[in-house]
Interface confidence: low
């Protein structure tokens, strides 16, 4: 196994959830072997590591909602990499599979007395991010009938309940989304357009919807292309001078892309004095993210994107803006979170990192440059899904009683996740969250258009929405310049 | 888990080789869930297991090969379908998961004395036949550094050593025979072809690279489908229909295709009416294979197909063909295996089926209508080239000993991959077994035709090969007919 | 019985070339060990040089000796090791040994040495 | 690359009595490590293998023990006939590279 020790964010409780966030970035190409992960992510991990943790202790403080049960976790880092998931993911299972080497008399003790084990076993897993990594997750999972409810994995690959039965996510599936990226093309006569996709689940199927849509629409995808995040810049400069070579005909490169290909394209148009000559139209992999567009703003402008609605959630921020080095000491990661973000020496704490040479200045606080996780709504919904459908397990197999009855020890994952299917609740931000017969949530998407708004100041402003199939435009504002 | 109990072959040994064989046919889609396996294969399933635990008698007795050392083996069912095989896996990998669950102190006795394992931890794995299945074994294996030799899995993305270190195999990759399916295009003018593949990994590279290669060579794909093995007799009718809505034009189907697609579409062409409508181009997974056409002749007929050169093993028919229910008890399967074959019962023996009416009479042999199976030298040879890379490791980590020494015990998976690596020694039909940088092996193939020889009579027959980018074609052997 | 024996030492001047010779009596190299070449200069410790894997020739050496030093399995009882550009520094008693690996089982079995003195 | 440390450069002891000696890895080299004793005039002759493995033939009055980066020689019954230079050897298995200590004299009085 990789040489790697693997670092854990555990929560006690009478009933475990699993979860997988990218609390690194993916391994780059050299690095794949070892499965060394990349840096510490804020939005996509940290922020996520600490929604689960203060979720759960909002669920255990709710009198209503699981009484006499406490929910604890044990949260682990899939470094947005197949390979890493299902690492961690063998350690949700290894229970399972302990448990059953017992029974079947593999396990002795030297004495031949019976052994116990010390770690409760994972009744569900929250996530992972990525349509690829949680397909492989699904993959072990279901062998082991662990519901698995993702709340950012988009593939339309994942409504197949034939393949992947224990998976639900509270987000739609990307075959709305491509739709919708369709209808933004018709809408403005763009008949000639580029194509560009992340290698993986997500990108390859979404993608695939994108061009049978576009093609019964009678739009052509001149030249269509495939890239991995983690590619080499050379990979990406080969992509960019191809899609130069179709200038000006194919100036619209639609981009069912993840975060990070677009950023890799950013770079890439910044090295090669391409800024300005696309306009991209980017799914929901990139939305509003400021750390796929950071330093690369100009290469930027333009781009027209897809975001799924989901609102700020305020009391996150109450409680994530106030945590500190010294004090939060439940989270494994953030010491190295906090020395990466501020980039400063952490001096006399057990995770001093001595690459940086400043030392850490007490008046930090996070509410400098704050940016909340685009998804960090649905990260939230996921968990109260299975908080609820754990309470609804509950409420029908231990009528009259509160509290964890014999009916519930160990929890059967086939009744959690038929209880979990039938769940509907009101969502963090006001929202029905409901599940159809795939598992999947409905959607409604905002369209993004990232603009200069005034000198070197650029942002993202919302130009639409596409709910249920209708796009709504405001086509002033996405054609209008800002800064003047 | 699944309710199925799990029928497991085993061989002892000092070192133990597992392997993963279709023994069974993959679940149909409503068995999909509970993992519950179709019938018995003899080419795929039983002769793969005969030949795993012949070849290891054969080195066992060899005193040049591993003197001193035993070779042993577990051998599990991969029923071909990705998540049967990574159960299966699991139990290979459960070893390794609990001698760390002891390191890691999860594991205690109640007297809090040591536990200890009764079960020897794999080594190595050999298989499994699908490419689909192998990458998600691969996905698995790899986390724990142990190697695994495929003998029929020649998808392109298995060359990817980023992805897929651990994947070694003893067949090409399909780039090649993607490459020689173009040149038979070529070489008879069709300008104009549908194209259908297997969902999955095997068919949806092999199809992507035979679009790519043709695109360049100016052929036009007009259209292109893909359909599961196990799909339903709707899917396969309702794709037969819109190939059909292609014709004349487009009467050429190029199928990169697992068999029983092939048979899929076979079978939808007799309850159509299309017998003789299309001439079929297919990959080598349908090849020169009966348990593809088998009732279903008349509508392969003209069929142009990719096989990857093996003569027959004839020591391995020496073998197997003596075989006996009433002795071959170290095979769990042999007995259903019989009886299915034969269509009946094995009145009185521990596995008797009463399903089958008729007694099986003692006279019956594995003689009668016997054909070995086509990959049975890539088996053969994949099970060799682990003996080969555990003898040099031995060579290596324990010069001057005879046995295990302590520097293999126990055996560390990445010295194992290196030594595998550089294994090289003369397969057993004589040619030369090696590995490329990316653990492939390099690859001849034939050219078959499917024809009747005569009234109700069809075969397959040899009509060219493509060898290294150089394709022969008897076209005059292509174009008779041989029924008058 | 089995033995070692090197020789080949001698004055050298600075800056020249040396090659010793290891040959084992009553060892066949077929039975693969490692031999391995470990210095000592006069009243000072041991010093490890290199070794070479009498199965392939495959060769191991001590970061400071690679370059300047090579070390060759030349029959199927001797071993050389080349020296080059030699100094003062490099004037010590010249030990071959064998092991069953390049270190971690130690050598079993020693020659009596050759001395090298480099000097004007 | 790995040093190895080797504590006391020298140690006296009478007949009968016990000497311990100690040898530091600046890298965990597992249990890679062999003792060797040296004579005036003499090669060195293998007493501990892999740490604790006593080398056939030498008197068990040599104990080998410690893994990781600590090490330990222990010659317990002394006679004058260890009189001798004992060295460590370290193989650091990830480089493939070894090294000694600085040696330790011991003297039996």
């Known amino acids: 196994q990789s040489s790697e020790r693997r670092v854990v964010a555990h929560m006690p409780g009478d009933i475990i959830i699993g979860a997988l966030f990218s609390v690194h970035h993916q391994p780059t190409v050299d690095k794949v072997h070892e499965r060394k992960c990349g840096a510490v992510r804020e939005q996509y991990g940290i922020q996520r590591v600490e929604a689960m943790l203060h979720t759960l202790e909002r669920i255990n403080s709710d009198p209503t909602l699981l009484p006499n049960i406490t929910l604890g976790c044990e949260i682990r880092d899939s470094c947005w990499h197949s390979a890493v998931a299902l690492e961690q993911s063998i350690e949700f299972i290894r229970d399972s599979l302990i448990s059953s080497e017992e029974e079947e008399g593999l396990v002795r003790c030297v004495d031949g007395s019976s052994s116990f084990r010390s770690k409760k076993p994972i009744v569900g897993v929250i996530g992972p991010g990525s349509s690829s990594v949680a397909i492989q997750v699904q993959n072990l999972l279901q062998l082991f009938n662990i519901p698995q409810i993702a709340y950012s994995a988009t593939s339309m690959d994942l409504s197949d309940k034939t393949l992947f039965k224990y998976f639900m996510r509270v987000v739609p599936s990307d075959a709305q989304q491509a739709r919708a990226m369709v209808d933004i093309v018709k809408r403005y006569n763009w008949t000639y357009v580029s194509a560009v996709h992340t290698e993986g689940n997500y990108g390859e199927s979404g993608m695939e919807a994108f061009k049978d849509m576009s093609a019964k629409e009678g739009i052509c995808i001149a030249h269509s292309y495939k890239i991995y995040s983690n590619a080499g810049e050379q990979s990406f400069d080969k992509l960019l001078k191809k899609l130069r070579s179709h200038l000006p005909k194919a100036r619209v490169v639609a981009c069912f892309c993840e975060g990070m290909t677009v950023r890799g394209l950013l770079m890439a148009m910044r090295r090669l004095g391409l800024a300005g000559e696309f306009l991209l139209l980017g799914s929901d992999g990139w939305a509003d993210r400021y750390d796929v567009t950071d330093g690369y703003q100009r290469e930027a402008v333009g781009g027209i994107t897809i975001k799924l609605q989901s609102p700020d959630v305020k009391w996150f921020d109450d409680y994530y803006l106030k945590l500190r080095p010294e004090t939060n000491l439940r989270n494994p990661w953030f010491q190295e979170f906090w020395q990466h973000r501020f980039q400063c020496r952490l001096e006399g704490f057990a995770q001093e990192n001595s690459k940086y040479n400043k030392t850490c200045n007490s008046s930090l606080t996070l509410r400098t440059h704050h940016v909340q996780d685009s998804k960090m709504g649905f990260v939230i919904n996921a968990i109260y899904s299975m908080a609820y459908g754990l309470h609804n397990m509950q409420m029908s197999l231990c009528p009259g009683y509160a509290g964890l009855c014999d009916a519930m020890k160990p929890i059967d994952g086939r009744k959690l996740l038929d209880s979990l299917m039938k769940t509907n609740f009101t969502g963090v931000s006001g929202d029905m969250i409901l599940f159809d017969e795939n598992g999947d949530s409905p959607g409604r998407y905002e369209i993004m258009n990232f603009k200069e708004m005034g000198k070197d100041y650029f942002d993202y402003i919302n130009v639409g929405s596409w709910d249920n199939g209708e796009l709504k435009m405001d086509d002033d504002e996405v054609w209008s310049k800002k800064n003047n | 888990q699944s309710s199925e109990r799990r029928v497991v072959a085993h061989m002892p040994g000092d070192i133990i080789i597992g392997a993963l064989f279709s023994v069974h046919h993959q679940p149909t889609v409503d068995k999909v869930h509970e993992r519950k396996c179709g019938a018995v294969r003899e080419q795929y399933g039983i002769q793969r297991v005969e030949a795993m635990l012949h070849t290891l008698e054969r080195i066992n007795s060899d005193p040049t090969l591993l003197p001193n050392i035993t070779l042993g083996c577990e051998i599990r069912d991969s029923c071909w379908h990705s998540a049967v095989a990574l159960e299966q896996s699991i139990e290979f990998i459960r070893d390794s998961l609990i001698s760390s669950e002891e390191e890691e102190g999860l594991v205690r006795c109640v007297d809090g004395s040591s536990s200890f394992r009764s079960k020897k931890p794999i080594v190595g794995v050999i298989g499994p036949g699908s490419s689909s299945v192998a990458i998600q074994v691969q996905n698995l294996l790899q986390l724990f550094n142990i190697p695994q030799i495929a003998y029929s899995a020649t998808s392109m993305d298995l060359s990817d050593k980023t992805l897929f270190k651990y994947f070694m195999r003893v067949v090409p990759s399909d780039a090649q025979q993607a490459r020689a399916m173009v040149d038979i295009v070529k070489r008879y003018n069709w300008t104009y072809v549908s194209a259908v593949h297997t969902e999955g990994n095997y068919g949806e590279s092999g199809m992507e690279a035979f679009k790519d290669m043709s695109a360049k060579e100016g052929i036009c794909i007009a259209h292109s489908y893909k359909i599961y093995s196990n799909a339903g007799e709707q899917s396969f009718d309702k794709l037969l229909k819109k190939l059909r809505s292609h014709l004349p034009k487009a009467r050429v189907v190029a199928c990169f295709c697992e068999g029983m697609t092939v048979r899929g579409l076979l079978m939808a062409m007799r309850r159509l009416g299309l017998a003789g409508e299309f001439l079929l181009l297919g990959s080598d997974g349908w090849a020169d294979r009966y348990d593809v056409t088998d009732g279903y002749q008349r509508e392969a007929v003209g069929g142009i197909t990719i096989k990857l050169q093996s003569p027959d093993v004839k020591w391995f028919d020496d073998y197997y063909l003596k075989l006996r229910p009433e002795t071959n008890l170290r095979n769990p399967w042999f007995q259903e295996f019989w009886q299915h074959r034969f269509q009946c019962r094995l009145e009185g023996f521990a596995q008797e089926n009463s399903k089958y009416n008729k007694t099986c009479n003692s006279s019956l042999t594995l003689r009668t209508h016997h054909v070995q199976d086509s990959k049975m030298g890539f088996v053969i040879n994949a099970i060799y080239s682990m003996a080969y890379g555990l003898h040099n490791m031995q060579m290596s980590l324990c010069p001057g000993y005879a046995g295990l020494c302590d520097a293999m015990k126990p055996i560390d998976g990445r010295k194992l991959l290196d030594s595998l690596m550089k294994t090289n020694f003369t397969g057993v039909s004589g040619d030369m077994i090696l590995f490329d940088e990316n653990g492939d092996s390099p690859g001849r193939y034939e050219i078959m035709n499917f024809k009747e020889m005569g009234k109700d009579y069809f075969d397959y027959i040899n009509v060219g090969s493509w060898d290294n980018g150089e394709l022969k074609m008897d076209d005059d052997e292509v174009w008779s007919k041989k029924n008058n | 019985q089995q033995q070692l024996e090197e020789s080949g030492g001698g004055l050298v001047k600075p800056g020249g070339t040396l090659t010793l010779t290891c040959k084992a009596s009553?060892?066949?190299?077929?039975?693969?060990?490692?031999m391995c070449w470990v210095r000592q200069a006069p009243g000072k410790g041991l010093e490890w040089i290199a070794c070479?894997?009498?199965?392939?020739?495959?060769t191991y050496y001590a970061s400071w000796a690679k370059g300047r030093f090579t070390i060759s399995k030349t029959s199927s009882t001797t071993v050389t090791l080349q020296m080059t550009s030699l100094t003062a520094a490099d004037t010590a008693t010249y030990f071959c040994?064998?092991?069953?690996?390049?270190?971690?089982?130690?050598?079993?079995?020693w020659g009596q040495g050759t001395l090298v003195t480099v000097s004007s | 690359d790995i040093v190895m440390t080797q504590t006391p450069a020298s140690v006296e002891a009478a007949v009968g009595g016990t000497v311990t000696i100690k040898c530091q890895a600046s890298e965990s080299i597992y249990s890679n490590l062999a003792w060797y004793q040296q004579k005036p005039g003499q090669p060195p002759k293998l007493l501990i293998y892999r740490a604790s493995n006593l080398e056939s033939g030498v008197p068990s009055r040599f104990k080998g023990s410690g893994s990781g980066t600590e090490f330990t020689l222990t010659i317990s019954d002394l006679e004058c006939a260890d009189a001798a230079t004992y060295y460590c050897?370290?193989?650091?298995?990830?480089?493939?590279?070894?090294?000694f200590g600085g040696g330790t004299e011991v003297v039996v009085k």
């Open positions: 050897q370290g193989y650091y298995a990830i480089t493939t590279t070894n090294a």
């Open positions: 040994a064998r092991g069953s690996g390049v270190g971690s089982y130690g050598y079993n079995l």
């Open positions: 070479v894997y009498t199965g392939d020739g495959g």
């Open positions: 009553g060892i066949d190299f077929s039975g693969y060990y490692y």
